[in-house]
């Protein structure tokens, strides 16, 4: 009699994550009597994937009715494939007995799974830095297969070169992750700047995935201070202004000191934004000259974004 053949016609099958995979298997003879089982992997550590007789395999269905008389098609369909399903699947014929005895295995079908990378997530520094300092941004994307992937960084459309990128794991795996760090030199003009991490992969339909971060979250632009005196008014009052310019973020507290004593404290709020994203603020202090015998030392003290206070002083001359 002709020797039983277990035929797995495809050496390899490739599917996209989320799709179904059909693994074909036919036998050349109904004899000897005995079940067919599907395994992933070979040898003692192999994993049972499908057994018609018993077990619960919610994602696996038989393509044709295996209970039908004279059925010789033992193909299976695995639904909702994930990268973890990758591997070599074997269709194995057993001879009925107590226990059943393995008789013949098919040549195996390698299941390869292609999976898209997750949307890149870009994170910036935990604390703000000032212009002329370098900060690091990190971009991460996970779950893709195959391993080949390209990642590029851009700042305002210009590609960044100070970049370090790793794809893990280094060896063979069902899926991979990428992590990249870009170092960005901040300038005072960067409040409206944006960094973009762009990930390209074979599974993406031509358009890279992008993750973005705004440099406004990472930058602190310290203010310039200027104290000036307006001309004396008829009522012997002098208007002194403290101009606080080009600062970011808006969080700012201004204190006026007269001869070292606190005169008034103000908090910046609802300021109009400059074109470059920074803010300006002007505070006025009226000084009654006739109430003073000596010159008055006025100090405009600015505490910006929790940083140490910056002072600018001005002396108002009191004529004898």
């Amino acid at each position: 009699e002709e020797e039983l053949q277990v035929i797995q016609p495809e050496k390899s099958v490739s599917v996209a994550a989320g799709d179904s995979a059909t693994l074909n298997c036919t036998v050349s003879s109904l004899i000897p009597v005995g079940p067919i089982q599907w395994f992933r992997g070979a040898g003692p550590g192999r994993e049972l994937i499908y057994n018609l007789k018993e077990g619960h395999f919610p994602r696996v269905t038989a393509v044709s009715d295996p209970t039908k008389r004279n059925n010789m098609d033992f193909s299976i369909r695995i639904s909702n494939i994930t990268p973890a399903d990758a591997g070599t699947y074997y269709c194995v014929k057993f001879r009925k007995g107590s226990p059943d005895v393995e008789l013949k295995s098919g040549a195996g079908t390698e299941l390869s799974v292609r999976a898209k990378p997750s949307a890149p997530v870009v994170s910036g520094p935990a604390v703000r830095a000032t212009a002329e300092h370098t900060v690091s941004f990190t971009c991460e994307s996970h779950g893709f297969s195959p391993r080949d992937i390209t990642l590029k960084w851009f700042k305002n459309g210009n590609e960044l070169s100070d970049v370090q990128t790793n794809v893990d794991p280094a060896g063979k795996s069902v899926s991979y992750s990428i992590r990249s760090t870009a170092r960005v030199l901040l300038t005072r003009r960067d409040v409206h700047s944006q960094v973009i991490c762009e990930v390209a992969h074979v599974t993406l339909q031509g358009d890279p995935l992008r993750g973005t971060a705004n440099l406004s979250e990472a930058i602190r632009v310290p203010p310039f201070l200027e104290v000036t005196q307006q001309s004396m008014r008829a009522d012997n009052q002098v208007n002194v202004t403290c101009q606080v310019t080009k600062f970011y973020p808006q969080r700012l507290q201004l204190t006026w000191l007269e001869n070292g004593n606190v005169s008034r404290t103000e908090m910046a709020s609802a300021l109009p934004e400059n074109k470059d994203g920074t803010y300006n603020w002007t505070s006025w202090l009226l000084v009654n000259v006739s109430a003073h015998r000596d010159d008055v030392k006025l100090t405009c003290q600015v505490e910006h974004d929790g940083q140490p206070a910056v002072n600018k002083s001005f002396s108002v001359k009191v004529s004898a």
Partner: antibody
Framework: VQLVESGGRLVQPGTPLTLSCTVS????????MGWFRQAPGKGLEYIGI?????SPYYASWVNGRFTISKTSTTMDLKMNSPTTEDTATYFC?????????????WGPGTLVTVSS | DIQMTQSPSSLSASVGDRVTITCRAS??????LAWYQQKPGKAPKLLIY???FLYSGVPSRFSGSGSGTDFTLTISSLQPEDFATYYC???????????FGQGTKVEIK
């Protein structure tokens, strides 16, 4: 799922010509599409692709000679200033469902002859 | 740009013969290689993608192998309908560009 090219004809050198690829059975917003050409008796040559969102990418040799664009059901290839070397059958094709590294559906092609 | 070198440029074979066509990339393309069959006046037809995966509906006598720079298309037993020109096509994941080999014409001996 079907692709059909149209617009191929005899054209004089320097006269712009637009070829169209009309698709049915799938959405152009879901797949990368490509243009290829084959000069008489020669091999296949890649011209460019357009991404699912409509961004075109070209082979390095194109240098502005072609422009790829698309609408909801057609993809166009504009030959900006054809020369006699552009005489060929032009094919459009769709990438496979698993990725952009291969093309599994092709149109029958449309013949462009550039001659004075 | 990547260059794809196909060999031989043509071959003569008989029905039932085993036919092997090779394709070499000028730099590694990992497994991003497809094989197409084209008959005169017709569009190319996909046979193999990702170097070794048989496209749906393609007879199992066609098989592909290789990775990196060296690839092979094998027809295990040539049939009358297999007389055609075969092209390899690469995709480079960094440049995201495509390149074809110059083609191999399989003729009847």
């Amino acid at each position: 799922v079907q692709l059909v090219e149209s617009g191929g004809r005899l054209v004089q050198p320097g006269t712009p010509l637009t070829l169209s690829c009309t698709v049915s059975g799938f959405s152009l917003s879901s797949y990368v599409m490509g243009w290829f050409r084959q000069a008489p008796g020669k091999g296949l040559e890649y011209i460019g692709i357009i991404s699912s969102s409509g961004s075109p990418y070209y082979a390095s040799w194109v240098n502005g000679r072609f422009t790829i664009s698309k609408t909801s059901t057609t993809m166009d290839l504009k030959m900006n200033s054809p020369t006699t070397e552009d005489t060929a059958t032009y094919f459009c094709a769709r990438v496979g469902p698993l990725g952009v590294d291969y093309f599994n559906i092709w149109g029958p092609g449309t013949l462009v002859t550039v001659s004075s | 740009d990547i260059q794809m070198t196909q060999s031989p440029s043509s071959l003569s074979a008989s029905v039932g013969d085993r036919v092997t066509i090779t394709c070499r990339a000028s730099q590694s393309i990992n497994s991003y290689l497809a094989w197409y069959q084209q008959k005169p006046g017709k569009a190319p037809k996909l046979l193999i993608y990702s170097a070794s995966f048989l496209y749906s509906g393609v007879p199992s006598r066609f098989s592909g192998s290789g990775s990196g720079t060296d690839f092979t298309l094998t027809i295990s037993s040539l049939q009358p309908e297999d007389f055609a020109t075969y092209y390899c096509q690469s995709w480079h994941y960094i440049s995201r560009s495509y390149t074809f080999g110059q083609g191999t014409k399989v003729e009847i001996k």
